[in-house]
């Protein structure tokens, strides 16, 4: 079953290569277990950035080596991606699945264009 997912159109990463955005889904029921996946689309290639599952009201659990962190509040997921560089500029798509209880719902956002600008190196001071 399909579900609507909303996310901002554009986000600018900080000078430290950190970008945050909210992914909001219109839950048709009372989900207790949710899976969130962030995918990057660039040059028609789609790659998985990170994925997490969480029980409603609890923290998101990403893999240890994940570049993502996040928190949840109701039907909103606050996602933060770290370690971004200019080459990581692209469309970051939020995918939400309501895993339990049945029925299973799937929603895919339109994507957030994240722009990353590498900071200029500090000039040497004599």
């Amino acid at each position: 079953k399909a579900m609507h997912v909303a996310q901002p159109a554009v986000v600018l990463a900080s000078s430290r290569g950190i970008a945050s955005f909210v992914c909001e889904y219109a839950s048709p029921g009372k989900a207790t277990e949710v899976r969130v996946t962030v995918l990057r689309q660039a040059d028609s290639q789609v790659t998985e950035v990170c994925a997490a599952t969480y029980m409603m009201g609890n923290e998101l659990t990403f893999l240890d080596d994940s570049i993502c962190t996040g928190t949840s509040s109701g039907n909103q997921v606050n996602l933060t991606i770290q370690g971004l560089r200019a080459m990581d500029t692209g469309l970051y798509i939020c995918k939400v699945e309501l895993m339990y209880p049945p029925p299973y719902y799937l929603g895919i956002g339109n994507g957030t264009q994240i722009y990353v600008i590498d900071p200029e190196p500090c000039p040497d001071s004599d």
Partner: nanobody, 119 residues
Amino acid sequence: EVQLVESGGGVVQAGGSLRLSCAASGGTFSFYGMGWFRQAPGKEQEFVADIRTSAGRTYYADSVKGRFTISRDNAKNTVYLQMNSLKPEDTAVYYCAAEMSGISGWDYWGQGTQVTVQS
């Protein structure tokens, strides 16, 4: 045209095992993910398990965790569901599904295979 064909369903006694297979045919492709869903009569469709190509990462519904194992053979474009310690409540039609890319949703579905667990 991609086709998913399930096999391996049947009737089994509670506590028994079955191994479902789902073979993809119709072309050369690399799926982002493949998974299993089930639907019992008069009930909503339920997610069972899936596996993502990227890291071979697996995910299971709590109701089957520790009893079912999903695996895939990329060379054969086949996904398997090993079901152990079956319970009567596992009785359902099991459907295989495949995602071509992570942002396409479940693009392809099999026709389903019936699993009946007798007590």
